[in-house]
């Protein structure tokens, strides 16, 4: 079943290569287990950036060695992606799945365009 997911259109990463955005979903039921996946779309290729699963009211558990961190509050997930470089500029899509209890719902946001600018190297000081 489809579910609406909202996320900002554009985010600019900071000078340390960190970008944060909120992924909000319109929960049709009372989900107790939620899964969030961040996908990156570039040149019509979609790759998984990170994935987290959590019980409502608990911390997000990011799977594998993740470059993402995050927190949840109600139907909002605050996502932070670290270690970004200019080459990582692209569209980052938030996918939310309500895993438990049935029925299963899935929603995909329109994506957040994250712009990353590599910092200029500091000039040598004499």
């Amino acid at each position: 079943k489809a579910m609406h997911v909202a996320q900002p259109a554009v985010v600019l990463a900071n000078s340390r290569g960190t970008a944060s955005f909120v992924c909000e979903y319109a929960s049709p039921g009372k989900a107790t287990e939620v899964r969030v996946t961040v996908l990156r779309q570039a040149d019509s290729q979609v790759t998984e950036v990170c994935a987290a699963t959590y019980m409502m009211g608990n911390e997000l558990t990011f799977l594998d060695d993740s470059i993402c961190t995050g927190t949840s509050s109600g139907n909002q997930v605050n996502l932070t992606i670290q270690g970004l470089r200019a080459m990582d500029t692209g569209l980052y899509i938030c996918k939310v799945e309500l895993m438990y209890p049935p029925p299963y719902y899935m929603g995909i946001g329109n994506g957040t365009q994250i712009y990353v600018i590599d910092p200029e190297p500091c000039p040598d000081s004499d």
């Epitope: 994935a51 019980m55 799945e97 438990y100 299963y104």
Partner: antibody, heavy 123, light 107 residues
């Protein structure tokens, strides 16, 4: 001990419908999801769908939406699957299975299976 | 849908040997994988879940491993009762699909 007792083998005519049952015992029926599987020599094992007996919430595999209807009766600790408009493609062994934990992250597993119900569709 | 591929449809081995059965997912399933054993005319029985956790009462000669898209089930020192079919199943996104199975036969 946990037991899932499925109904007996069925021989049905094409176009007919059949209802399979799965009686659970040895645990609290409403504490665990009940899933249904189909097994054929050609397509192997396929996941049909899941029902939460507590809430009645259901998720179907899109492939079986409109073909299978899942229900659960809390008073008799029995799950049912109705299969509609049967064709030869529906001839298979059907299993009810219990998911091994109620909504705990990572506990995704079918820990108990019924003995299976053989359905043969033939005129 | 995620496609689970067990490339080896059948393999034969002798009692006492060690065998490894593999399963590949079409996308990262983050260890959300179970292995089942099925004997002829019987229902599947749980062996391993979360890719590497043994089910209750499963002998320690069975072990699961893998990550991402590649997973395997290893059986050390095969016993006569280990012969049958083995299936993997993912639990990432619905529908929760199975591999086509690997039939383990006595050599």
């Amino acid at each position: 001990q946990v037991k899932l007792q499925e109904s007996g083998a069925e021989l049905v005519r094409p176009g007919a419908s059949v209802t399979l049952s799965c009686k659970a015992s040895g645990y609290t029926f409403t504490d665990y999801e009940m899933h249904w599987m189909k097994q054929t020599p050609v397509h192997g094992l396929e996941w049909i769908g899941v029902i939460d007996p507590e809430t009645g919430g259901i998720t179907y595999n899109q492939k079986f939406k409109g073909k299978a209807t899942l229900t659960a009766d809390k008073s008799s600790s029995t799950a049912y699957m109705e299969f509609l408009s049967l064709t030869s493609e529906d001839s298979a062994v059907y299993y009810c299975t219990r998911r091994g934990a109620r909504a705990t992250v990572y506990n995704y597993v079918m820990d108990y299976w019924g003995q299976g119900t053989s359905v043969t569709v033939s005129s | 849908d995620i496609v689970m591929t067990q490339t080896t449809a059948s393999l034969s081995a002798s009692v006492g040997e060690t065998v490894t059965i593999t399963c590949r997912a079409s996308e990262n399933i983050h260890n959300y994988l179970a292995w089942y054993q099925q004997k002829q005319g019987r229902s599947p029985q749980l062996l391993v879940y979360n890719a590497k956790t043994l089910g209750d009462g499963v002998p320690s000669r069975f072990s699961g491993s893998g990550s991402g898209t590649q997973y395997s089930l290893k059986i050390n020192s095969l016993q006569p009762e280990d012969f049958g079919s083995y299936y993997c199943q993912h639990f990432w996104s619905t529908p929760w699909t199975f591999g086509g199975g690997t039939k383990l036969e006595i050599k």
